[in-house]
């Protein structure tokens, strides 16, 4: 089994995979075979309203901070970035001691698997099936930027849900042979986004490839830097009763998916206020309605939030209302 | 491609139990409220009520509020509306949509699931 | 008022225009969209909020309002647009969605 396999994102397309040799081959080591598989988000990401009060998002490695000026006044809701209850630690000193004594048994019995539980694999089609058990590891959204540690194992895994459009059984993992190195340079990949990195090390070619047990690890590449902005017109409709249903393109292609947007409008002379506008909500109104508004100029600029932090804002959109007929409410049905 | 695939075509007697289905794919199904919209035979469409699979959120028409049970299961994509006890006037086509543009259009339907409630 | 009215019938001449409309008080403070049903299909949306067509829709399908009346306009229209067409928005509550009763197109 490859030894201590370690994954670093140095881009948005690209994760950088190192490892070392097995401590006692099975024979001479002829070459490494690297799958990978796109990872579905946890669920609760989609189910989460980061909109609710105290509810902070998941922390994250490359997230910028909000700025202050802009984050003043939250009439609506509070949120800010900072570590949620969500992600691991890091790992002390002591802790990496213990694990490295853990893993010199786990290598001793690994070896012992390896020996006895030898895997013959036909990669004549130059692909391999997909493993459609995805693994439970829950992962930090952290992860990518630190090292991350593999564990190898044998163990099946059990299903888990998935909320984002997975890879249909039928299409197979991409993979890479590597000859006469320790390390690959996965590219082409899509940003801010979770990857199961599969590594075996083989001792014979032909006629039949013999491989080891797998290691697995995991990794995200880095952030997009303007896929979370909102691209073209943000419109608005002024119905009867001062009604003022904002509407607005969601990012296509986000740095993992849009958590929430912000909504920051004001009157002419006034302080500017803010809404928080949830995923779910979103859903349903492809915008924001505002009502309660007093006579007079607004503009209004939005911006989207995703797993990677905020996007930047939209050009301002101005609208007038001429009267006040309705119930002072923010955010309208 | 977005698909949605309702279950087929059921017979029931009144007063019996029935649940069908549409399993969405080639989206994130959490992330789009599913609509239910009945068609009763040579009429127009009504609509039901909807629900958001993330968290199970339902809204319905007070038309149908109490009458049918609309829910998801968002591990295998799937959508519900059920029935605890069956009318004859429960005879109709039921689609489910996506509410891609939300409140203001559904974007793709299943392709209908033809209930018969008859003795 | 929750219900939304439409004239249960209209016909056109092939290659003219023709105006379907849908009434009701919440059109006041809502989007209508407007749905295309071919007999043994499910519905196909044409327009949607402030005159959107889906991709694949013709551009001869076009969305208005004004106060509690929405439109649908067909400018030239084709043998293949015969249908029923359902308009739809939210009750005045915005708690639920309503159809419109449904227009029968006939081009002639």
């Known amino acids: 089994v490859p030894l201590d396999p370690i994954s670093v994102s140095n881009s948005s397309s690209q994760i950088i995979l190192k490892w070392k040799p097995p401590s006692d081959p099975n024979g001479n080591i002829t070459h490494y075979l690297v799958f990978w598989e796109r990872q579905a988000e946890d669920s609760e990401l989609f189910e989460l309203d980061y909109c609710l009060k105290g509810l902070k998002l998941p922390s994250r490695t490359w997230s910028p901070p909000f700025e202050s000026e802009d984050s003043q006044k939250h009439n609506q809701s509070e949120y800010e970035d900072s570590a949620g209850e969500c992600c691991s630690c890091p790992k002390t000193d002591s802790q990496i001691l213990k694990e490295l004594e853990e893993s010199s048994f786990r290598k001793t019995f690994e070896d012992y698997l390896h020996n006895v539980v030898f895997v013959p694999r036909k990669t004549s089609s130059g692909t391999g099936a997909e493993d459609p058990r995805p693994s439970r590891k829950r992962r930090s959204l952290g992860d990518v930027g630190n090292v991350t540690v593999a564990v190898p194992t044998v163990a099946a895994f059990p299903n888990t849900s998935s909320t984002s459009v997975p890879t249909s059984p039928e299409e197979h993992r991409p993979f890479e042979k590597v000859v006469n190195k320790e390390s690959l340079v996965i590219s082409g990949l899509r940003h801010f986004t979770g990857y199961r990195i599969e590594l075996q090390a083989c001792n014979q070619d032909t006629p039949e490839e013999r491989c080891s047990v797998a290691a697995y690890v995991s990794a995200r590449t880095m952030p997009e830097a303007k896929a979370d902005d909102i691209v073209g017109p943000v419109t608005h409709e002024i119905f009867e009763n001062n009604v003022v249903h904002l509407m607005w393109q969601e990012p296509k292609e986000p740095n993992g998916l849009i958590v929430l947007y912000e909504v920051s409008y004001r009157r002419y002379g006034d302080e500017e206020l803010h809404l928080c506008v949830s995923r779910k909500h979103f859903a349903l109104e492809r915008g924001c309605r505002l009502r309660g508004l007093s006579p007079g100029n607004y503009s209004v600029r939005i911006r989207a939030t995703s797993l990677a932090g905020n996007g930047s804002w939209t050009e301002p959109t101005y609208f007038y209302v001429t009267d006040y007929l309705d119930v002072p409410s923010n955010i309208a049905k | 491609e977005v698909q949605l695939v309702q279950s087929g075509a059921e017979v029931k007697k009144p007063g019996e139990s029935l649940k069908i289905s549409c399993k969405g794919s080639?989206?994130?199904?959490?992330?789009?409220?599913i609509g239910w919209v009945r068609q009763m035979p040579g009429k127009g469409l009504e609509w039901m009520g909807i629900?958001?699979?993330?968290?199970?959120?339902?809204r319905y028409s007070p038309s149908f509020q109490g009458q049918v049970t609309i829910s998801a299961d968002k591990s295998i994509s799937t959508s519900y509306l059920q029935w605890s006890s069956l009318r004859a006037s429960d005879t109709a086509m039921y689609y489910c949509?996506?509410?891609?543009?939300?409140?203001?259009?559904?974007?793709?339907w299943g392709q209908g699931t033809l209930v018969t409630v008859s003795s | 008022s929750s219900e939304l009215t439409q004239d249960p019938a209209v016909s056109v001449a092939l290659g003219q225009t023709v105006r379907i409309t849908c009434q009701g008080d919440?059109?006041?403070?809502?989007?209508t969209s407007w749905y295309q049903q071919k007999p043994g299909q499910a519905p196909v949306l044409v327009i949607f909020g402030k005159n959107n067509r889906p991709s694949g829709i013709p551009d001869r399908f076009s969305g208005s309002s004004s106060g509690n009346t929405a439109s649908l306009t067909i400018t030239g229209a084709q043998a293949e647009d015969e249908a029923d067409y359902y308009c739809n928005s939210r009750d005045s509550s915005g708690n639920y969605a309503v159809f419109g009763g449904g227009t029968q197109l006939t081009v002639l």
């Open positions: 080639g989206y994130s199904f959490t992330s789009y409220w």
């Open positions: 629900i958001y699979p993330g968290d199970s959120d339902t």
């Open positions: 919440s059109l006041r403070s809502y989007y």
């Open positions: 949509a996506r509410l891609g543009s939300g409140w203001y259009g559904n974007d793709y």
